[in-house]
């Protein structure tokens, strides 16, 4: 019996469409596959950052595959051919791998790249990052924000900066259709006629840096002699009920009595007769059901009773 | 509840000066651009400019270039334009309005401070 | 400076029917792939009501029978079907670059 072998891919390789991290990788059908017409032949495709401890593999009969890279680091991929062992009436055979890198070349030293850079989406609604400028840059350094994510048909330049001193150092974005749930991407990169300046890539999925407005419309409510209901409403704008966790700051009598954790609009609290105030705050954040991470919104304005009769039905500021 | 405070009126003589005062509350006060805009009566709305409190950015329309001065207090969330040369010209409403970025308009308005000018 | 001219200066129309603004600007307001268009609302002695930005979203809590189309230096508001609580001055105002202006305002009033 002769050995049955394949060819890797032809052709492997990284292509960049300007959508700052989003790449394709992409080959051609390996050489000489005459013999197994019949074949539905597979690749196993093996791609990376370098600097990254583990591969992402993954087996398709596709000539091309998309994902997400860290612009700032290279990457590099490997490929190879698999015939199913249908195809070879015994066991799989797996060609060589062929082999690819892409990166872009770094200009300027890290030091002249952005620093701190903080991206907030507010409400769900209005995202706006901040930078400060690269150490020991000139004033007539000046740097660009564009961002990409998919449905849009290519990457956009900040519409409204942020500017201190004549520098940009930050983006009020315009509305972003479409644009949670899935990988945004960010390219910040400047000028400077006296130096070449380095850029910087950034990834993130909008749902997990919300920081939502906070509660509103704070009750009192009259349970029973011992107990009493805070209650408050959703911050307004478009987040769901379902999307919220809260924390709570009750004060009673001027002494922290409880911070709480809850997932809906109420607090039952125990109390005694001789409580002469009481206070709460509220904060709501975007919990796990909708977002992987998020950002506590501002404490409520503070809503409190104070008097003889905490008995009375309803305490409504 | 996004709320933008500003007095009813002001009286002002001929040739003086006056600043008009827009308290913001309900919402981070750095975040978004305050604009300042002029309405006589029966007349069209009149942009005069407007001032970014995150860093004190400020664009004017030239019309009102040496009019009007913006400026912010972002301790007190106040927005200040002050207006110099008074002349019964400048006897209008003027609204401050929040907005976030060109792109979204301008959607918080206050109730707007009517200025007479007369001796 | 960019120059709005809105029509016609008013309008009546009858209620449950459609009403129809025009604004045209003197040079395109589209960048970025966007239309810095945006429509208000002014009734007497109030302040102007954000009704669409961008040409064709809608502000925060207004009506859907509100709704703005266009992009260049053509543009229109559509109010259907037409309610009393419409009866207003309604002004176009682009805000693609320093200074924003704003169109010279369509009364539209009940038929």
């Known amino acids: 019996d002769t050995e049955i072998k394949v060819n890797p891919p032809q052709d492997f390789e990284i292509v960049d469409p300007g959508y700052l991290g989003y790449l394709y990788l992409q080959w051609q059908p390996p050489l000489s596959l005459d013999h197994f017409k019949e074949c539905t032949v597979e690749y196993e495709l093996k791609y990376r950052n370098i600097g990254s401890e583990t591969w992402k593999t993954i087996i398709t009969k596709n000539l091309h595959y998309k994902d997400g890279f860290d612009l700032n680091k290279g990457i590099e991929a490997k490929i190879h051919t698999l015939l199913p062992w249908q195809c070879t009436n015994g066991s799989e055979v797996q060609s060589s791998w062929a082999e690819t890198t892409y990166w872009i070349s770094p200009q300027g030293i890290p030091e002249t790249k952005v620093q701190d850079m903080d991206c907030v989406y507010y409400n769900w609604q209005y995202l706006l990052c901040s930078w400060k400028p690269g150490i020991g840059v000139l004033l007539d350094t000046n740097y660009n924000l564009f961002y990409w994510y998919e449905g849009l048909d290519h990457a956009l330049q900040c519409v409204d900066y942020i500017k201190a001193d004549g520098q940009n150092i930050g983006c009020r974005f315009p509305y972003l259709e479409a644009s949670d749930y899935k990988d945004f991407y960010i390219c910040v990169n400047g000028s400077s006629e006296n130096k070449p300046i380095r850029s910087s890539y950034f990834t993130f999925q909008l749902q997990n840096i919300v920081k939502p407005l906070p509660p509103v419309y704070l009750t009192f409510t009259r349970e029973s002699s011992c107990e009493i209901k805070l209650k408050w409403s959703i911050p307004l704008g478009p987040i769901p009920a379902r999307c919220f966790d809260y924390e709570i700051e009750i004060r009673e009598d001027d002494t922290t009595l409880v911070t709480a954790t809850v997932e809906n609009e109420t607090y039952t609290l125990k109390t005694t007769n001789e409580t002469r105030q009481l206070c709460f705050v509220v904060r709501s954040k975007v919990n796990i059901a909708c977002s992987d991470d998020g950002i506590w919104s501002e404490w409520s304005d503070k809503q409190c009773w104070e008097g003889e009769d905490l008995s009375k039905k309803t305490l409504l500021r | 509840q996004v709320q933008l405070q500003q007095p009813g009126a002001e009286l002002v003589r001929p040739g003086a000066s006056v600043k008009l005062s827009c308290k913001a509350s309900g919402y981070t006060f750095s975040n978004y651009l305050m604009n300042w805009v002029k309405q006589r009566p029966e007349q069209d709305l009149d942009w005069i400019g407007r001032i970014d409190p995150y860093d004190g950015d400020i664009d004017y329309n030239q019309n009102f270039k040496d009019k009007a001065i913006l400026t912010v207090d972002k301790s007190s969330s106040t927005a200040y334009m002050q207006l110099s040369s008074l002349t019964s010209e400048d006897s209008a409403v003027y609204y401050c309005?929040?907005?976030?970025?060109?792109?979204?308009?301008?959607?918080?308005w206050g109730q707007g401070t009517s200025v007479t000018v007369s001796s | 400076d960019i120059v709005l001219t809105q029509s016609p200066a008013s309008l009546a129309v009858s209620l449950g029917q459609r009403a129809t603004i025009s604004c045209r600007a003197s040079e395109s307001v589209d960048n970025y792939g966007i239309s810095f268009m945006n429509w208000f609302q002014q009734k007497p002695g109030q302040p102007p009501k954000l009704l669409i930005y961008a040409a064709s979203r809608q502000g925060s809590g207004v009506p859907a029978r509100f709704s703005g189309s266009g992009s260049g230096t053509d543009f229109s508001l559509n109010i259907h079907p037409m309610e009393e609580d419409d009866t207003a001055m309604y002004f176009c105002?682009?805000?693609?670059?320093?200074?924003?202006?704003f169109g010279g305002g369509t009364k539209l009033e009940i038929k």
């Open positions: 309005a929040r907005g976030y970025g060109t792109a979204y308009g301008v959607d918080y």
């Open positions: 105002q682009q805000s693609k670059e320093v200074p924003w202006t």
